[in-house]
């Protein structure tokens, strides 16, 4: 029960995160005009990964997309990357966890294949998280360095009285959304590979026979061949050929990868 | 058809206190911003005051602390209450609605005389 | 508080002539979101209100003749009729519409020769 809950919370705060991220990538106010200490203008800039948008006190806003690939900033560039590919594998994500989910059966996948699922998906939603909190980490110190350099030359002298004015930009609100959506999709994951670990079966990896020293504990599973077509209701019964071979649902057993998360 | 129509005006003594009024028609105060221009006579125009759809205001410092624009809504009409008149702010007072572009003022009131004098 | 200068005071230019009034800006009213120019010219015909003729600089206002056009960006802007007519004696104003509080030029009366 305490699986299911940590997976489907882990599905729903990464859902949110990863809804986050998406609305901070399309939001135009990652950096805004900074109003303190400046000149109070009627007009009010304000600049996202993919557009600049001026508003006026009237209220008329106008946007102008960055129509160009070549004469944009790298930074821009490697933000929009980071941002695009938080997207993708948290999407990714959403749609292999929404299979993984304890919750909902779909034909008769083994809790193993579940668990495997739960974990790849934990993983992509810790990367993305990461993605989108790098990204717009990248883009808070481009915008901070640019501050203080517009701010060394807030106002320039231009032959006497005339003066030019630099419009400093400052943290906008998307920097804000896409570092709380990180942070949930990040958390959404690890709750996810927590989930995962939960869901995974503690039971030893058994041969055939089994001797032990004290000589009357022997543990003999029957029903293995019946067991080896992988149908029926006794799917949990092992395959007792091969020695070592393991069926999909001993992939956890003991000793598994899954223990050094 | 948009229309400004100011009242209010009149002679005062230095010192009084005055509210002009603008009543509008066409629009709607809650959409577009008006401001407040003042002429002294035979001079050039000066700003006064702004109040926009949002209801923030702005003002000419130097009149600021005397001057304060409101507006009534339900009456789509818009006010400047002066305070502590002088001379000097003897003027044709006009109301004037914002355009949507430019932050440019593209109607105006006839105005209304106000003079300060004992 | 931003200065707006205009020049000349007065002018007086014959029928059908070319007038240019400059109006000068104690910083720039350009803004780099938009590379628009937040200056506006009105026109002021006696015992009238003003009427707005130009904003951003150079784009006109609807109904306003063609013959009127502005130029100019950052701090330097110019009004131009290109052919007077004896309905545009009147005082021609620059206006900073840019930073608050937003100021206006002393005026040019522009006569007939």
């Known amino acids: 029960m305490a699986v299911t809950a940590c997976q489907g919370l882990g599905f729903v705060v990464s859902l949110i995160g990863i809804a986050g991220i998406i609305a901070a990538t399309c939001m135009d106010q990652w950096s805004t005009q900074d109003l303190y200490n400046n000149p109070v203008t009627a007009v009010f800039n304000y600049q996202g990964l993919w557009r600049s948008c001026v508003r006026e006190s009237s209220g008329f806003t106008e946007c102008r997309g960055y129509f160009t690939l070549l004469g944009l900033p790298a930074m821009l560039q490697a933000v929009r990357a980071l941002m695009i590919v938080g997207i993708v594998l948290g999407a990714i994500g959403l749609l292999v966890s929404i299979f993984a989910l304890k919750c909902i059966r779909i034909g008769s996948m083994e809790d193993s294949a579940k668990a495997n699922m739960t974990l790849t998906s934990g993983i992509m939603f810790i990367v993305s998280g990461l993605c989108a909190i790098a990204g717009v980490s990248v883009f808070a110190n481009m915008l901070v360095t640019n501050f203080w350099m517009s701010t060394a030359n807030m106002y320039t002298g231009m032959g006497g009285m005339v003066q030019t004015v630099q419009t400093r930009y400052t943290f906008g609100a998307a920097l804000f959304v896409g570092w709380v959506a990180g942070g949930l999709t990040l958390i959404g994951g690890v709750m996810m590979c927590i989930a995962c670990r939960g869901l995974a079966p503690e039971e030893t990896n058994y041969k055939a026979v089994s001797y032990h020293a004290s000589g009357h504990s022997v543990a003999y599973k029957p029903g293995g061949f019946k067991a080896s077509t992988g149908f029926g209701s006794n799917t949990k019964n092992k395959k007792i050929y091969d020695g070592g071979a393991r069926t999909e649902d001993e992939v956890q057993s003991y000793p598994s990868k899954h223990d050094y998360v | 058809e948009v229309q400004l129509v100011e009242s209010g005006g009149g002679l005062i003594q230095p010192g009084g206190s005055l509210r002009l009024s603008c009543a509008a028609s066409g629009f709607s105060l809650t959409t577009y911003g008006v401001h407040w221009v003042r002429q002294a006579p035979g001079k050039g125009l000066e700003w006064v005051s702004v109040i926009w759809a949002g209801g923030s205001t702005n003002y000419n410092s130097a009149l600021m602390s005397r001057f304060t624009i409101s507006r009534d809504n339900s009456k789509n009409t818009l006010y400047l209450q002066m305070n502590s008149l002088r001379a000097e702010d003897t003027a044709v007072y006009y109301c004037a609605r914002a355009a949507y572009y430019g932050n440019g003022l593209d109607y105006w009131g006839q105005g209304t005389l106000v003079t300060v004098s004992s | 508080d931003i200065v707006m200068t205009q020049s000349p005071d007065s002018l007086a230019v014959s029928l059908g002539e070319r007038a240019t009034i400059n109006c000068k800006s104690s910083q720039t009213l350009l803004n780099s979101g938009n590379q628009k120019n937040y200056l506006t010219w009105y026109q002021q015909k006696p015992g009238q209100p003003p009427k707005l003729l130009i904003y951003?600089?150079?784009t006109g206002e609807s109904g306003v003749p063609d013959r009127f056009s502005g130029s100019g960006s950052g701090t330097d802007f110019t009004l131009t009729i290109s052919s007077l007519q004896a309905e545009d004696v009147a005082v021609y104003y620059c206006q900073n519409a840019y930073f608050y509080p937003f100021t206006f030029g002393g005026g040019t009366k522009l006569e007939i020769k």
């Open positions: 951003w600089a150079s």
